[in-house]
């Protein structure tokens, strides 16, 4: 039977010889030579040997056990003479041993990590990771410790999983941002003589609102035209903040000062700046200079970090509002005058005044518009802004007149404004009443006395404060022997009657009756209007049968028996 | 009233991108800040990040090499993008909006009805 | 991070009861933390933040307490719309973080 256990061999050979492996042996070897042994398998005849009489294995090569760390081998033994095989085929192997020549590698020749700045102590930051491709299941050669050589006392890591921590309270990005770690794997446990190989760990601190904005000065001052509208920009201010991002993020606002009111702070989120603006309408000459306190502040703070402190800042913004020549400014923003229709030429209605609002005071002169008055019916004094008329007026033409006055700064035409003028033309009873319509009526032949004919109505075109008093009366030469009488209904109407039983056309065909119409204001106007009758044939019913023809071309005016 | 809605494929396939819109109504994004939260299988949830009304983002470290969140502020919309996505990533997602409550502190106020996405091949 | 620990995960009740919903969080969060609501097929609602002060609409049978690391929330006199999932979260620090919730059923 064979004789012999498993070869061992040491890697990494480094003799001149070649390296003894072991020794195939067959209890049937009497040592006369009569056996010759043989090799077959793994590397034989090319990395293993034997001598064929003595069965002796050599190495003829240096050998890796990270390479190959088992070789399988067939052992034959056969007698020479006969060449039939003294012991069964065996196989049998050839274990490499491992020596401690890999140090670790790690799997990133550079990591990149980050971790949040003021971190506590111990927070995570990133694992690094070293393999050794010696022996793990023998000896040491393959026990990877981890050490830091580089980057204490900011950071730490743990030896046995190579987890880097942070090491350091109150980490600032704002003092340092950049940290380069180096960390050391070495095998053998750490011990003496192990081999170590090393990885660059870049780690950036990320930022967090730890820093609160801070205004670079202590007053900003802005000058702004009063003439600024609401929502005019007048200026910016900035505030910093060490921080970034969403941690530098600032919103400005007013907290205090005398201009509260009249200006707004805005914060541009593109710039991240303060954009102070006008909200009120200003006034040189009631304030010159307001002054505000304006707050930057992040909106945002990671609640753990408000310790630190307020996270906002304030200024005093010192607004000037400077002189703009302003227009004349009207005492009211529409004047409204009275004057009666009878008034002269150069009666004065009433004035206007208007005052240059700064505190230069330029005098001013008054004109009117004479697109708003192109008949020239009214003009104005120019030095005191009185207004009186320059031609006779009529109510009864036009009540209103609208017309626009102008005051122009005399140093300066360019400044000038306007007011509305709106003059009421008062009423003057200077018209007489009238018929509303003209009256043509007829009377039939066997009509009665006192029977009503026609109801008349008038007009008056003045408008007198009490209303309409109008009086009828038949015109004094036509009153006496009158075939008709006149009825005043104390109504602003009359009605005309028949005074007697019975008319003949063939008689008189056609009746002209003169009535005058008064009214009861002061001066008293009257006027005469003519009421034509005709007398008619009627049916028993009353209704009109048949006139004269000629009563229907007969001139108006007065006859004769009315 | 805020409304929030979010929109996007239910399916995405694994190492590929995840994209959702969320839509806002009657409010501007302009204001406030607008983030993403999602609810895995089983309850657990997760905030992902948030964009400020000026437009800076702040993300979970645990997912900050593969997501962007973005907006359209003509469209009043913001955008998630989730990079690398695997079977994990598999949640019912949520847009969102957060107030300041004073003393510096968002708070969410204001949840879309959340869209379901499943990571599968 | 903040770690957050509800319990109970399941709790069922019947109308005009009361309740109380536990929230630890692993380390101090002062007072900076919210409980919400979500009823099935509805959006989440903010009902408490800062640790008890109650949101806007939120009915006054809620409740809330605890700072630190201990929180709970209350609800006195359950009505049948009160059933539901809640769920708190903390914003002391990033990553604002979660519990998992409390699943509160009609019994």
């Known amino acids: 039977s064979w004789m012999w256990n498993q070869f061992f061999l040491l890697e990494e050979y480094t003799g001149s010889d070649y390296q003894y492996v072991g020794k195939l042996h067959s209890d049937q070897d009497r040592g006369d030579g009569s056996l010759k042994y043989i090799l077959s398998g793994d590397g034989a005849g090319d990395l293993f040997i034997i001598n064929e009489n003595t069965g002796d294995i050599q190495a003829t090569k240096r050998l890796d056990r990270e390479e190959k760390p088992v070789y399988i081998l067939r052992a034959q033994a056969i007698n020479r003479r006969t060449g039939r095989p003294v012991e069964p085929e065996s196989e049998f192997i050839i274990k490499i041993h491992d020596i401690n020549d890999n140090e670790p590698i790690f799997t990133k020749e550079v990591y990149t990590a980050t971790v949040p700045e003021m971190s506590d102590v111990g927070t995570f930051v990133v694992q690094v990771t070293a393999t050794d491709a010696d022996d793990p299941t023998y000896g040491n050669s393959a026990k990877v410790v981890y050490s830091i050589l580089q980057g204490q006392p900011y950071f730490s890591v743990e030896s046995e999983t190579g987890i880097i921590k942070t090491a350091l309270l109150n980490m600032d990005r704002e003092n340092r941002e950049q940290y380069q770690v180096v960390i050391q794997a070495k095998d053998m446990g750490g011990q003496m003589g192990g081999l170590s190989g090393t990885t660059t760990v870049n780690i950036t601190l990320t930022d967090v609102n730890d820093n609160p904005p801070r205004f670079p000065q202590s007053t900003y001052q802005f000058k702004t035209p009063e003439s600024s509208p609401p929502g005019t920009p007048i200026g910016r201010i900035k505030a910093s903040d060490a921080d970034v991002g969403e941690n530098a993020e600032i919103e400005y606002s007013i907290t205090d000062g005398e201009g509260l009111d009249m200006f707004d702070v805005i914060t541009d989120q593109e710039t991240q700046e303060g954009i102070i603006t006008v909200k009120k309408l200003l006034d040189f000459e009631k304030k010159k200079v307001y002054t505000l306190k304006v707050e930057a502040s992040n909106p945002y703070v990671e609640p753990r970090f408000l310790y630190l402190g307020p996270f906002k800042d304030s200024a005093t913004v010192r607004i000037v509002v400077e002189d703009v020549d302003e227009p004349p400014v009207f005492s009211k923003l529409a004047y409204i005058l009275q004057i009666r229709e009878d008034a002269q030429i150069n009666t004065t209605i009433g004035s206007v005044t208007a005052q240059d609002p700064d505190a230069a005071r330029n005098p001013v002169k008054y004109s009117v518009d004479r697109h708003t008055d192109m008949d020239r019916i009214f003009n104005i004094d120019s030095g005191n802004g009185s207004i009186f008329t320059s031609k006779l007026l009529d109510r009864e033409t036009l009540l209103w007149h609208n017309i626009t006055v102008i005051a122009t700064e005399i140093n300066n035409p360019k400044q000038s404004s306007r007011v509305p003028l709106y003059i009421k033309v008062l009423d003057v009873n200077d018209n007489a009443p009238e018929f509303a319509e003209f009256y043509e009526t007829f009377v039939c032949e066997k009509a009665k006395a006192d029977q009503l004919i026609q109801t008349l109505h008038a007009v008056d075109k003045d408008d007198p404060y009490s209303g309409h008093q109008f009086s009828f009366s038949l015109a004094p030469e036509a009153a006496s022997g009158s075939n008709f009488t006149i009825q005043d209904n104390k109504d602003n109407t009359a009605g005309i009657l028949t005074r007697k039983n019975g008319y003949n056309r063939h008689e008189m065909s056609t009746y002209l009756l003169p009535v005058v119409i008064s009214d009861n204001d002061y001066p008293v106007q009257s006027s005469t209007g003519t009421v034509t009758v005709r007398v008619c044939a009627c049916d028993h019913h009353g209704n009109m049968q048949s006139c004269h023809a000629e009563a229907l071309i007969h001139p108006t005016g007065l006859s004769t028996g009315a | 009233e805020v409304q929030l809605q979010e929109s996007g494929p239910g399916l995405v396939r694994p190492s590929q991108s995840l994209s959702l819109s969320c839509s806002v109504t009657d409010y501007s994004i302009t204001s406030n800040y607008w983030g993403w939260i999602r609810r895995f299988p089983g309850n657990k949830m997760e905030w992902m990040g948030y964009i400020t009304y000026s437009g800076y983002t702040s993300y979970n470290p645990s997912l900050q090499s593969r997501i962007s969140i973005t907006r359209d502020t003509s469209k009043n919309q913001f955008f998630l993008q989730l990079n690398s996505v695997t079977a994990e990533d598999t949640a019912t997602y949520y847009c969102a909006r957060s107030i300041n409550h004073g003393g510096y502190s968002y708070v969410v106020d204001a949840w879309g009805p959340g869209a379901s996405v499943t990571v599968s091949s | 991070d903040v770690q957050m620990t509800h319990s109970p995960s399941y709790l069922a009740a019947s109308p005009g009861e009361s309740v109380s919903i536990s929230c630890k969080t692993s380390k101090n969060i002062s007072n900076y933390l919210v409980w919400y609501q979500q009823k099935p097929g509805e959006a989440y609602k903010l009902l408490i933040y800062?640790?008890?002060t109650l949101q806007s609409g939120t009915p006054s049978r809620f409740s809330g307490s605890g700072s630190g690391t201990d929180f709970t929330l209350t609800i006195r006199s359950l009505e049948p719309e009160d059933f539901g999932l809640y769920f708190c979260q903390q914003y002391y620090e990033k990553p604002f973080t979660f519990g998992s919730g409390t699943k509160l059923e009609i019994k």
């Open positions: 800062s640790g008890s």
